[in-house]
Interface confidence: medium
């Protein structure tokens, strides 16, 4: 088992919204749960966009999940990852609001 590296980034979009993206990379096996939490609970699936789980060329895999949030509300959101019995929560980095 190779645990994922998780990275959360923000990109600015229009009208006071930003897109937050949670990327998991370099993990094996390929089964992984990656989802955004708002206020401590999962966002509905129709507000999130997932990338395919793809090989990264090193015998491991990568994927991502993204959602659009209101600028200034970053503190309410975390990315949750579960892989091979290990798990963690990853906040949106500060200083983006």
């Amino acid at each position: 088992t190779v645990p994922p590296m998780v990275n959360v980034t923000c990109s600015e979009v229009s009208e006071g919204n930003i897109t937050v993206t949670c990327r998991a990379s370099s993990f094996y096996p390929r089964n992984i749960t990656l989802t955004w939490r708002q206020d401590g609970v999962s966002l509905s699936h129709n507000t999130q966009q997932w990338g395919d789980v793809l090989p990264d060329g090193n015998g491991t895999y990568q994927t991502w999940v993204a959602t659009r949030i209101r600028q200034g509300e970053e503190q309410r959101f975390t990315c949750y990852m579960e892989h091979s019995g290990n798990h963690g929560t990853h906040p949106v980095p500060s200083g983006n609001s």
Partner: antibody, heavy 119, light 107 residues
Framework: DVQLQGSGPGLVKPSQSLSLTCSVT???????YYWNWIRQFPGNKLEWM?????????NYNPSLKNRISITRDTSKNQFFLKLSSVTTEDTATYYC???DGRGAWFAYWAQGTLVTVSA | DIQMTQSPASLSASVGETVTITCRAS??????LAWYQQKQGKSPQLLVY???TLADGVPSRFSGSGSGTQYSLKINSLQPEDFGNYYC?????????FGAGTKVEIK
């Protein structure tokens, strides 16, 4: 360390409103976290009622329809529960509790406040 | 709403025994599960969150497991202070809901 303390009348008449206060010490309720009310009925069933967040937004249990309101007084570092049109079915022990944005599990609870609805 | 079904409703065990409490969700809650212990006249206390993570200060004889809709709390080598009621709670979606509880009595 953060401490929560619930208070309010122990007896409320049917059709009236139930009002409870949660006083928080050791942490500002506007800084972070989610400030909740949970009740436990006779027989021990637990029901999440709703929260007010650090930013002032609310989320309520739909089972309480339009009877519930959770507000706050930031100057006193308190938040409040108001439940209107109570019946004997609202007799319960009421807890205030906190969770954080990592996940909605309750790591901090006040002692319970028993509220009896009776004529 | 996600409904949480706990079993058994009560159990009685001797000190040193291992006991297991189960919680079934009406839908997949993806490990978004917490367990609490409550003693008579006291507030619930967090034991486990994210299905498997022990809260601070919780003895290692407690462990959580499960996935999907089926979860368990195991207490190894039951101690006298472990008596009380145990509750599961999901946080996959709103409204947050709890199981009806399991009463653990010491023989």
């Amino acid at each position: 360390d953060v401490q929560l303390q619930g208070s309010g009348p122990g007896l409320v008449k049917p059709s009236q409103s139930l009002s409870l206060t949660c006083s928080v010490t050791g942490y500002s309720i506007t800084n972070d976290y989610y400030w909740n009310w949970i009740r436990q009925f006779p027989g021990n069933k637990l029901e999440w009622m709703g929260f007010i967040s650090f930013g002032g937004s609310n989320n309520y249990n739909p089972s309480l329809k339009n009877r519930i309101s959770i507000t706050r007084d930031t100057s006193k570092n308190q938040f409040f529960l108001k439940l209107s049109s109570v019946t004997t079915e609202d007799t319960a022990t009421y807890y205030c509790a906190r969770y954080d944005g990592r996940g909605a599990w309750f790591a901090y609870w006040a002692q319970g406040t028993l509220v009896t609805v009776s004529a | 709403d996600i409904q949480m079904t706990q079993s058994p409703a009560s159990l009685s065990a001797s000190v040193g025994e291992t006991v297991t409490i189960t919680c079934r969700a009406s839908g997949n809650i993806h490990n978004y599960l917490a367990w609490y212990q409550q003693k008579q006249g006291k507030s619930p206390q967090l034991l486990v969150y994210d299905a498997i993570t022990l809260a601070d200060g919780v003895p290692s004889r407690f462990s959580g497991s499960g996935s999907g809709t089926q979860y368990s709390l195991k207490i190894n080598s039951l101690q006298p202070e472990d008596f009380g009621n145990y509750y599961c709670q999901h946080f996959w979606s709103f409204p947050l809901t709890f199981g009806a509880g399991t009463k653990v009595e010491i023989k």
